[in-house]
Structures are given as C-alpha cells and as structure tokens.
C-alpha cells in the first residue's frame, strides 16, 4: 500500500543496501524510489553526529517493512514504488547554505544561482552545482558557479556552508536545451569508453537503461545474432569528454544510439511493456506462481513490489488447468543477469516503472480520420472551464498538464473576479453531459502570467490549480509539454480542439470539435497581421485559404501536435482576426517558451 507520510525522529532498523547523501528527506525518498531495490529509507537531518548529517540510507526488506526505532533527527519513510501516482526525478529546489560535493569539473563566474542551474542543466555532464553568493566570505569565490558530477549522480557528501546554494540539473524536468537525438543506428558500434554494461533484450531497453543511468551519454547494443556469444544481448553504456562518440565502427548485428536524458518527458524511458518471446531472463528468483499466460504473469510481477522482471514458461501438460509457471525475478540493478534464447519461455519487465514516465506519454485512442466531431478519449487532456455566475456556461478550453494543473489562456479570466465561480470538467465529450450533479474540479487558484496585458500583446497564458487531484483514466490524462531540446522540431500533425463557434456568429458547440491545421511560420503570419507584432512567444496555425480555425469559445484550449507517437501541447488558443479568414491564421501562445514559467509556478505552489 502507498505510504507517502514521513516519520519524524524515527529510523528503520536493518535492511541497509546503500548509503548516499541527499539534501532533504523528500529527495532521499525520490532516490529510494528510483533505486532498483529500495523500498524504505532513513534520512538523517541535523543530529548530534555531524558525520551522519544528510545521509540517506536505502533499505530493502522481504516483508516490505522494518522495525521502527526512535532516533532524534532521523526521518524515515517508504519509497513511492508502492504508489500509483506519477513519480518524477525533477527537483527544482535550491538548497541554501549547503555544499553538495562531487567532482568539480567546471568553475566560472555566474550572475545568479538560477543562471548557474541553467548552466548545469545545459551541460551534458552536470548532475548538480554549488554557487557561492555575493555575500560569500572569500571575495574571489563570490558568484562562482561550480558544475559537478559523480558516478551515481548523487553528491558524495553534503556539508553545511554559509552563503552558498546548491541544486540539481533540471534535465529530468525536460528543461535542457541540449540536442535530443532519438535515432537508433543499426550496424553501428560506438568505440568510446564503457562506464557500465548490462543485459538487455533489445536496443530500446538498452537506450532506456542509458537514459536512466546518471553518466551514460550514448550506448552500443549487441543483438542476439551478434557473432561473439559472450557479448550477445550486451548493452554497453558509454561516455566521452565531448559528449559525442569519437569513433563509429560499422558492424553487423550491433545498434547504437543516445541517451534521452534531454528529452525524457517526450517518450517513455523507464517502462518496457513488450514481451520477449522464446527468451529467458536470469536473475535472483523471488517467487514461482502458476499463471494463465504471460500477460497474467506480467501483471503479477507488476503487483509484486520487489519483482523487476519475469519469465513465463507455458504449461506442457493440461493437468494443472493449463497454468504455466511464472518466475518472478530481481537483480541488483534491475536488469537480467543473463538472457537466454530458444527455450520457449516468454519474458518481460514489471510495469510498475511506467509511472516514472510522464503519464502524458501513454498511448491514447487512435485518431478518427475525417469528420469534425471528436469521440470520447480522443483528446483526453482537453477540459472545459465553466463560469457559474450569473448563469453557468462554458467559458474556455484548457489542457491537463499535471494531476492538479490546467494550462489555459490568461485572457479567459479578464472578467473573472474569483476562482470560486469556476468549475473544471474533464473527460467530457458533450457539453450536454454536464448536469447539476456532474463531478467537477473546483479551482483553488488562477495564476496569470504577470506580463499579460492583452491576448494580442502576448503572455496569454494561465495556470489553474485544482482543489483536488485528477485520477488519470483513458478519458482524462495529461498532455506532454514540449521539451526545450525540441525547439527546432517541425510539427506536421497538429490539431486544434474545442467547443467554440464553428463560424464567427454562432454558438458554443455541444460536441468537442477538432480540426487538423498546419503550422505557419511567424514571418508568414506577421504578413497577415500588420497592426500587431507576432512575437517569438507566439505560434500561428491555419490554412492560407482559411476555412479551418479556432474560434470564440476555443480560447485556452490546446493546439496539440503529434511527434514521435507522443502528443505535445505546442500552443494555447489565444487570438486571431475573425475566424478561419483567408491569410489570417490563428495565433497561439507558444508553450515551449513558457516551460520554465510553468515549472516555476507549479513547483512553488
């Protein structure tokens, strides 16, 4: 069962698997969650023994719990592995008066801690940083930004130090501007130094492992047809000083590619849902259970907290009701210790790690081609914002971007004096479904960009913080924010959705409408709007001849673009001249330009 509570002045006795340093108990809990075996942890805050400060002891237990003992300054808790909510490694906190130690590999002057953190985020080797503020006692060290890395991505120690701040790279928040290379190159071996090697069933799993590894920048995978038997299914994790492979060698049956650390939110990286036929995963055996088929075996593994992967052996005889043997397994690093083929078994991984991926990457219902009306579950991030005063009506669209957050347009709230009169309905296809007793989310807070004045001048973006959290289902789930590393992506499959007017003088539609609309360059768009400035924080979409566009009532809703099988919230419906007019494209808020703002506001709230 999910236990998010932290226990103060308590430590778990025994079960130690590793001791690391973290700046807070919360961060310790995240480290535990991402560790392949950690189920519980004890964090030492400032106690009597300074050598124990900031230690995070990761623990495992066959019974999933350990004896709790009293200890001043200790904070204990459980990993989020047992929880169904989404888990992110993203940590935007900066820690004042803490020096997080690692290998300093770059030292330079920075204007602020924020600039230092950006430098770290955009440096491929950087895990965390320490910045000496302008009040630091040693004059020459003031405003110095130290970029650091370690073998584990976690500090080797943490010390109290006045007038410094430390923090982590925001790569895992999808905030890096570094290039994101998604190609996997066949018949290619990267010849650079190996930092680690693991067993993997295919190049995609190898890439995921590389992405998850703190120092892996690229990888080479030898398939099961690789001539050297001892190297088959071997996944070599690699790095280099430049961050790029120095040598590529052409070799058959080998595949190479890059870590997705700079585009982590754009495709699933932790979750391996495939089944590997005629394949046996070796590892430490946790349990053997009888199951009807490999899907049931995977489900059992997913529901068994310590299970990391499984092998299913179909039944050879019918006497046990056709049930095969489901071997639940684990290892020290979460990967099989060896992979064998040709024994008729089916293997795979736990799906427990799927929640470590952004929920927005989950595959959704296939698009209905043709027609303008949507079907339920086609745009599960689309919500309708209602205003209840003086009478209840649809006000604007919006998009689910987190389990308590809606992204919408600022201009929707020009006349709204209080969040109390707002209601958010999700999982809705037809406005007529909304009755007096229909479930809605109250709005706790409306956060409007502080530079917003009018839609036409930009910054037309707002966040709604909901009073309760959304449980994701097929009909209500988030859309991915674009990754800053994907700034130059040319989106070709973009759709605008909403319940807005279908022509300028019209009324709100009952069924959610959709229209496929091409993106237009800002130069082209500017030509149609002589009296307005189309800024780089805006993006335009529309047909030259007009005819399809967003219109009144669609405001705040998404301009959704599909890229690499994942939907991204590229724009927020903002303004335009009329609706669907010739050479007057719709103007949208360019979401990628506000990713930092969104993160800042959602984290601080």
């Amino acid at each position: 069962e999910c236990m998010t509570k932290l226990f103060q002045d308590t430590y778990f006795h025994g079960g130690d698997i590793a001791v690391v340093f973290t700046p807070s108990a919360k961060h310790c809990q995240v480290v535990c969650t991402h560790h392949p075996r950690c189920l519980l942890f004890t964090f030492m805050a400032e106690s009597e023994d300074p050598t124990k400060w900031f230690t995070c002891t990761l623990k495992d237990s066959v019974t999933e719990t350990l004896p709790m003992l009293n200890m001043a300054g200790a904070i204990s808790g459980y990993s989020f592995k047992q929880c169904s909510h989404q888990i992110s490694a993203c940590n935007t906190n900066v820690y004042v008066d803490l020096d997080m130690k690692g290998v300093n590999y770059n030292s330079s002057v920075s204007k602020s801690a924020q600039e230092c953190q950006e430098r770290c985020t955009n440096d491929m080797h950087c895990h965390f940083f320490t910045y000496a503020t302008r009040h630091f006692p040693s004059v020459k060290h003031r405003n110095v930004c130290l970029l650091k890395y370690t073998q584990t991505g976690i500090p080797t120690s943490i010390k109290k130090l006045t007038d410094v701040v430390s923090g982590f790279s925001l790569k895992s928040c999808a905030l890096s501007n570094l290039a994101c290379i998604r190609d996997i190159f066949p018949t290619t071996v990267f010849a650079d130094s190996n930092i680690d090697s693991v067993m993997a069933p295919d190049a995609f799993v190898c890439r995921s492992i590389c992405t998850h590894h703190p120092n892996c920048l690229f990888f080479t995978f030898f398939s099961q047809e690789w001539p050297t038997e001892s190297e088959r299914n071997l996944c070599l994790l690699k790095t280099s000083n430049s961050g790029l492979p120095s040598t590529r060698i052409r070799k058959n049956k080998a595949f190479s590619g890059f870590s997705l650390q700079n585009c982590r939110h754009s495709i699933p990286v932790f979750c391996h849902s495939s089944f590997y036929h005629d394949t046996e995963f070796l590892g430490e055996e946790l349990d053997i259970v009888g199951e009807n088929g490999h899907e049931a075996c995977q489900k059992t593994c997913t529901n068994t907290i310590r299970c990391q992967f499984f092998t299913y052996s179909p039944s050879q005889e019918s006497c046990n009701g056709g049930k095969g043997k489901c071997y639940l397994k684990l290892s020290s690093n979460g990967s099989p210790t060896k992979i064998l083929h040709g024994r008729g078994s089916i293997s795979g991984y736990t799906l427990r790690l799927c929640k470590m991926d952004n929920a927005c990457t989950t595959k959704i219902k296939p698009r209905i081609v043709g027609g303008t009306k949507s079907v339920l579950g086609e745009w599960p991030w689309q919500i309708t914002v209602h205003i209840t005063s003086p009478t209840q009506r649809h006000l604007c669209g919006g998009s689910i971007i987190g389990n308590q957050w809606i992204l919408t347009a600022a201009h929707c709230f020009n006349e709204v004096e209080s969040p109390r009169i707002l209601r958010v309905y999700s999982g809705i296809l037809n406005q007529s479904e909304i009755k007096e007793d229909t479930f809605f989310f109250g709005v706790q807070e409306v956060i409007i960009h502080d530079q917003f004045e009018a839609a036409e001048t930009g910054y037309d973006i707002a966040l709604l913080k909901l009073e309760t959290t959304i449980n994701y289902t097929d009909s209500q789930r988030p859309i991915c924010l674009p990754s800053k590393g994907d700034r130059n992506v040319m989106y070709t499959d973009c759709w605008v959705t909403g319940w807005g007017y279908t022509k300028l003088r019209d009324k709100i539609q009952n069924t959610l409408q959709k229209a496929k609309i091409p993106l237009v360059t800002n130069e082209e768009c500017q030509a149609g709007y002589r009296s307005h400035k189309i800024t780089n924080k805006m993006i335009c979409a529309g047909y030259k001849e007009g005819g399809k566009d967003a219109c009144k009532g669609d405001s705040g809703g998404p301009l959704s673009c599909k890229h690499n099988e994942v939907w991204h919230l590229v724009g927020i419906t903002s303004w335009g001249e009329g609706c669907a007019q010739r050479e007057r494209p719709g103007v949208y808020t360019r979401v990628v330009e506000y990713v930092d703002w969104i993160l800042e506001k959602t984290q601080e709230a």
Epitope: V103, N104, N106, S107, V109, P137, V139, K140
Partner: antibody, heavy 116, light 107 residues
C-alpha cells in the same frame, strides 16, 4: 583519489629561472584552482600565487614581476615559472588544491636549492 | 596586502589541556580564515576553513571562532599527536597570506 605531485630541478644557480610542474590526479583542473606555496628551511609558509579553474591568475605582490603560473588542463599539469632566482628563494615548493580559498589537498613538495 | 599575525611563536601545553592560538588580521577579513597543522617533514594539513568549518575527518576537539580581524583556534583537549606548528591563513582577498605560525610543544 585526489593527489598532487610536484617535480622540479632540485638545484638552480643564482639569476637562473625555475620551472616546477604540479601533476594532479583524481580531479579536473577546469573545476578547481591550484595554489603555489613555499616554505624556506625552518621558516613559515609563504603564498606565491594561484591559477583558477577558468584560467585566471593571482600573484603575491612582492613576487609578481618574477612569477608566472600556467596550466595544461588536458595533461592535468600546472606550471610555476620564476626567474632571477636568488639564494633566499631556496625553499620547499608546494602545490595545493583550492577549496573556497583554503587548501584542502597538498602535494608532498619539491625542494629547491639556489646555489652556485 | 593583508598581514596575518600570530602573536605566539611557541606555546607550551600538556596532554589533556585546553589551548587557544590567536591570529590577528591587519584589516577586516570577514570570516575567511583557515587553520593548518604541519608536522616535521610533512605537508600542511587543512583543519578549519571559513573560521569555524571543520575539514572532513578532523576530530571535533579542533574548533575555530572569530570574525573581522580577531580569530582563535582551540584544541579542547590536547593529544600527543597534536604537537605541531599551526598556521592561520586569510582567504578573504588575494594575495592570500599566512600567519607566521605557532609551535605547540610539550610543557
């Protein structure tokens, strides 16, 4: 682990130049400053100068005109050059790593004797 | 340039004693003072930095205090292995400078 090792000529004639190399391992010179400190026989420590991670340098005011510190990041080496040596430059020369102005790791030192 | 003065060149002590070494800066150095221990034939070893922060692995009998121009280094209970020369150093402003050193010897 962190190590610093000085290597120098040992004996130099007066008015000649000195070149000492500090070779480091276990850390990167782009991320840390390196100091040079000397200690004449039976005397105290004297700060000579330093080179920062980003290549900036600072020198002891009294020796500035005779000193030059440089480095080669790729070879993990820092160089101390000093000209117009006199007998009172006889000392043990240490390199040390910077930790916010203090020196957390020191080499074993190399002894220089200035004598004809 | 900043001059650091350790008024006592020698201090006598016995095992178990509490001893304090003082260091004075010629101008305000905030809290940017470090203390080093040097034993015969060895390199100096960092004990305290930024006035009061103990370096990793340094026993807690060694402490530092002060700010501005006056600084004190204290050994709460002297051990035989603590007999050595102790130097203060300002790391407030370059050129950094050391005090002349205080030799702690057996009474």
């Amino acid at each position: 682990q962190v190590q610093l090792e000085e290597s120098g000529p040992g004996l130099v004639a007066p008015s000649q130049s000195l070149s000492i190399t500090c070779t480091v391992s276990g850390f990167s010179l782009t991320g840390y400053g390196i100091y040079w400190v000397r200690q004449p026989p039976g005397k105290g420590l004297e700060w000579l100068g330093m080179i920062w991670g980003d290549g900036r340098t600072d020198y002891n005011s009294a020796l500035k005109s005779r000193l030059s510190i440089s480095k080669d990041n790729s070879k993990s080496q820092v160089f101390l050059k000093m000209n117009s040596l006199q007998t009172d430059d006889t000392a043990r020369y240490y390199c040390a790593r910077d930790y916010y102005g203090s020196k957390d790791y020191w080499g074993q030192g190399t002894t220089l004797t200035v004598s004809s | 340039d900043i001059v650091m003065t350790q008024s006592h060149k020698f201090m006598s002590t016995s095992v178990g004693d509490r001893v304090s070494i003082t260091c004075k800066a010629s101008q305000d150095v905030s809290t940017a003072v470090a203390w080093y221990q040097q034993k015969p034939g060895q390199s100096p070893k960092l004990l305290i930095y930024l006035t009061s922060y103990r370096n990793t692995g340094v026993p807690d009998r060694f402490t530092g205090s002060g700010s501005g121009t006056d600084f004190t280094f204290t050994i709460s209970s002297v051990q035989a292995e603590d007999l050595a020369v102790y130097y203060c150093q300002q790391h407030y402003k370059t050129p950094y400078s050391f005090g002349g050193g205080t030799k702690l010897e057996r009474l």
